[in-house]
């Protein structure tokens, strides 16, 4: 009676700060209707850095303003997060609600710990 | 800081309607679940309804299906339960509860407001 | 629907005794959707657990729980007076959100 939703534990971040990881969920029933959020924790604390809902077949359509940009195929969701730097490392948890129609269903990943490496500044050059 | 406060709840008659509100500070509706639990006197709780997030998804218990219906004023952060048709078995108290970040337990409730249908 | 039965009904217990209580599912619960609360005589419920075993916060450490599948437990490891309340067990994993009758526990 809950969802499964599996994610790949470690993902690093590339040297432009852009993390990219799959979110698969088992689905129990046929949503038409899903909404995925990417939580974020770290030293205990839990915050939300996007979230998107779409219909089945439809794009993901993250807020404007948001960090998160996603494509979805079937029940997987392909995530990518831009503007990371090191102190965003953490683990990033995906979850995925079936909103419709009813029931409703729940399902939490294990989380993807993002490692993220700020690039070494440029040498100046003396020529 | 959070909070949860109910209104709108009294004495009605069978068949008749009521509408009560859930007026929430210190956190943004959108965000979250809310939910109404109920409890009948003397009895234990029982899930209500759900508006989630944006307000166009709503899920009910069966057992008020049809009847009751949710609805939310996102500019006065209040969320309402207009109860029809009611009957004897849906006197209550009724609570206003927020969805936690993990999914749909309660991690912030309202004090209650009771709800007796009687004739 | 997933029905949830809590037992005992009631469990009389002395102050600084270790209160253990029951919550069992009619069908398999993922341990990360299930709750704990406590109720006192004319107060809203209070959220003490989540996801099986975490914390709510503000709770103190003396209640913890556990379980999976179909069987959890909230265990309180030494009664204080204020713990003398009615506990209900909540699944969240799919709708209807359904509640245990309540485990009672009150003063020997």
């Known amino acids: 009676k809950a969802m499964h939703v599996a994610q790949p534990a470690v993902v690093l971040a590339s040297s432009r700060g852009i993390a990219s990881f799959v979110c698969e969920y088992a689905s129990p029933g046929k949503a038409t209707e899903v909404r995925v959020t990417v939580l974020r924790q770290a030293d205990s604390q839990v915050t939300e850095v996007c979230a998107a809902t779409y219909m089945m077949g439809n794009e993901l359509t993250f807020l404007d303003d948001s960090i998160c940009t996603g494509t979805s195929s079937g029940n997987q969701v392909n995530l990518t997060i831009q503007g990371l730097r090191a102190m965003d490392t953490g683990l990033y948890i995906c979850k995925v609600e079936l909103m419709y129609p009813p029931p409703y269903y729940l399902g939490i990943g294990n989380g993807t710990q993002i490692y993220v490496i700020d690039p070494e500044p440029c040498p100046d050059s003396d020529f | 800081q959070v909070q949860l406060v109910e209104s709108g709840g009294g004495v009605v008659q069978p068949g008749r309607s009521l509408r009560l509100s859930c007026a929430a500070s210190?956190?943004?509706?959108?965000?979250?679940?809310m939910h109404w639990v109920r409890q009948a006197p003397g009895k234990g709780l029982e899930w209500v309804a759900v508006i989630w997030y944006d307000g166009r998804n709503k899920h009910y218990a069966d057992s008020v299906e049809g009847r009751f219906t949710l609805s939310r004023d996102n500019s006065k952060n209040t969320l309402y339960l207009q109860m029809n048709s009611l009957r004897a078995e849906d006197t209550a108290v009724y609570y206003c509860a927020r969805g936690g970040v993990w999914g749909s337990y309660f991690d912030y409730w309202g004090q209650g407001t009771l709800v007796t249908v009687s004739s | 629907e997933i029905v949830l039965t809590q037992s005992p009904g009631t469990l009389s217990l002395s102050p600084g005794e270790r209160a253990t209580l029951s919550c069992r599912a009619s069908q398999s619960v993922s341990s990360s959707y299930l709750a704990w609360y406590q109720q006192k005589p004319g107060q809203a419920p209070r959220l003490l657990i989540y996801?099986?075993?975490s914390r709510a916060t503000g709770i103190p450490d003396r209640f913890s729980g556990s379980g999976s599948g179909t069987d959890f437990t909230l265990t309180i490891s030494r009664l204080e007076p204020e713990d003398f309340a009615v506990y209900y067990c909540?699944?969240?994993?799919?709708?209807?959100?359904?509640f245990g009758p309540g485990t009672k526990v009150d003063i020997k």
């Open positions: 996801g099986s075993s």
């Open positions: 909540q699944h969240y994993g799919s709708s209807p959100f359904t």
């Open positions: 210190g956190f943004t509706l959108s965000n979250y679940g």
